[in-house]
Amino acid sequence: MAVTACQGLGFVVSLIGIAGIIAATCMDQWSTQDLYNNPVTAVFNYQGLWRSCVRESSGFTECRGYFTLLGLPAMLQAVRALMIVGIVLGAIGLLVSIFALKCIRIGSMEDSAKANMTLTSGIMFIVSGLCAIAGVSVFANMLVTNFWMSTANMYTGMGGMVQTVQTRYTFGAALFVGWVAGGLTLIGGVMMCIACRGLAPEETNYKAVSYHASGHSVAYKPGGFKASTGFGSNTKNKKIYDGGARTEDEVQSYPSKHDYV
C-alpha cells in the first residue's frame, strides 16, 4: 500500500513539475525591466526565451520573436536546449511511469518489469528536474552579470547633457516557476526511485525450507509474502516474495544446502 502511495504521489508531483517546466519555458517573463531607478515607467519591458515584449500604459502589449538563431547569445541557446531536454525527458518519463503504476494492470506485466519502469521514469524525472534547474540557474546568472554590467555603465560617460537610459533587467516570474517546477520534478523522480525499491523482487528468493524429521519426511513451507500471515520461518530474517500469483499449495519445495537432515 505504501509503495503504491509513494509511486502515485511521485507521479503526481512529477506531472505538476513537468507542467511547470513547460509553462516556464513558454512564459515571456524570464527577465523583467528593473524599476528600481524608474518606478513610474510608461513603458515596461520583459523578455522570454523566445520573444521580447513591451507593455505600454494603455495595456497595449507588443511582442517580437527572436527570428534569428545564429545571432542569439550562446547562453540563451544553452538555456533553451536545457529546458527542451528537460521537457522531452519529463514527457517520456511520464509516459513510462503511467505503465509502471502499480494501480494500473496491463496484461500480465511482472512486478519486476514495473519496478524497472518505475526506476527508469524516476531517473528521467530526476534528470529532467536537474535540466530545468540548471537552465533557469544559467539564465539567472546571465541576468545578474548583465545587471551589474549595465549598472556600471549607468554611472560612466554621463559628462554630456544627453543621457542614454540603459534598461536593466531583473528576475522574472518564469525563473521562480522554473525553479519550483524543476524541484518538484526532482522530488517526484526521487519518490519514484524509492517506490521502485518496494516493487522489486529480492534477488535471492527463498521459496521454501525443508525440515527432514527422522522416520518420515515432512516439508514445512512458510508462505510467500503475499499469502503468509508473517509468522513463517525465514532462515536469513528476510522477507520471502512469491514470484507469481499462485496459491501456497502450488509452491514447490526444492532441497537446498540449507536443508536439515
Partner: antibody, heavy 119, light 113 residues
Framework: EVKLQESGGGLVKPGGSLKVSCAAS????????MHWVRQAPEKGLEWVAY????????YSTDTVKGRFTISRDSAKHTLFLQMTSLRSEDTAMYYC????????????WGQGTSVTVSS | DIVMTQSPSSLTVTAGERVTMSCKSS????????????LTWYQQKPGQPPKLLIY???TRESGVPDRFTGSGSGTDFTLTISSVQAEDLAVYFC?????????FGSGTKLEIK
C-alpha cells in the same frame, strides 16, 4: 463619436479647493487610461495626472503631488480631478484627454474648463 | 524629469512651402525592447484643444494628412510639413511619452504669410 466634456471650473481663492469633472461618451470608458493636462494663459501644455483603466495606478507631476487627486467613476463614465491648496500658478485651462491605445499618446481631448486662482 | 526643447519658437512660411521643426529631449526616448521612440506630436489651433498628429515619433494618427511626417530617433526629432496649407496655422508641441511625468516642449508656432 468620442466626446469628452469638462465641467466644474471657476474662480477660487488661493488655498481653496475645487473639483473638476470630465464626462466621457462614445467609447468604453473603463477600457482606457485618462489624463489631465493644463495650459496656463498664453503658455504651453503641462501634463498634470494620469489614471490607469483599472483605477489601480495613478501618476501626477511633482508640482501637484499631494494637492491634486485624480479619480474615476467607470459606472458614470466620469473622470475627476480634486484640487486642494490651490495656488495662483494653478490658473489654467484644464483639459481631460483619453490615453491612446498606442504609444502612450493622448488621442482625444475635451474642450477644457477654466480654473482661475485669485484673491 | 525629461526636458523637451523645441526650435524654432515660431516660424512664418508661405502656403505650399516645406517646413521642418525640431524637438530635442534630455534623455533618449528610444526603448530598446521594441526599438520604438516614445515621442508624440500635437497640433493646437487657436481656441481649440490639442490634436494628436504623430506617435512613436513617426506613426501618423488615422485621419492625419500625409503631408505631416515625423522622423528622428533617440534624442533628436523632426516634424516636417511637406506642403503647408492655410489650415496648418497652429502651435505644434512635442511630448515625451517614455516615462512619467510626461513632459511637453514649449511649442513651435507656425504662421502663414
Amino acid at each position: 463619436e468620442v466626446k469628452l466634456q469638462e465641467s466644474g471650473g471657476g474662480l477660487v481663492k488661493p488655498g481653496g479647493s475645487l473639483k473638476v469633472s470630465c464626462a466621457a461618451s462614445g467609447f468604453t470608458f473603463s477600457d482606457y487610461g485618462m489624463h489631465w493636462v493644463r495650459q496656463a494663459p498664453e503658455k504651453g501644455l503641462e501634463w498634470v495626472a494620469y489614471i490607469s483603466r483599472g483605477r489601480s495606478t495613478t501618476y501626477s507631476t511633482d508640482t501637484v503631488k499631494g494637492r491634486f487627486t485624480i479619480s474615476r467613476d467607470s459606472a458614470k463614465h466620469t473622470l475627476f480631478l480634486q484640487m486642494t491648496s490651490l495656488r495662483s500658478e494653478d490658473t489654467a485651462m484644464y483639459y481631460c484627454a483619453r490615453g491612446s491605445y498606442y504609444g502612450n499618446a493622448m488621442d482625444y481631448w475635451g474642450q477644457g474648463t477654466s480654473v482661475t486662482v485669485s484673491s | 524629469d525629461i526636458v523637451m526643447t523645441q526650435s524654432p519658437s515660431s516660424l512664418t512660411v508661405t502656403a505650399g512651402e516645406r517646413v521642418t521643426m525640431s524637438c530635442k529631449s534630455s534623455q533618449s526616448l528610444l526603448n530598446s525592447g521594441n526599438q520604438r521612440n516614445y515621442l508624440t506630436w500635437y497640433q493646437q489651433k487657436p481656441g481649440q484643444p490639442p490634436k494628436l498628429l504623430i506617435y512613436w515619433a513617426s506613426t501618423r494618427e488615422s485621419g492625419v494628412p500625409d503631408r505631416f511626417t515625423g522622423s528622428g530617433s533617440g534624442t533628436d526629432f523632426t516634424l516636417t510639413i511637406s506642403s503647408v496649407q492655410a489650415e496648418d496655422l497652429a502651435v505644434y508641441f512635442c511630448q515625451s511619452a517614455y516615462s512619467y511625468p510626461f513632459t511637453f516642449g514649449s511649442g513651435t508656432k507656425l504662421e502663414i504669410k
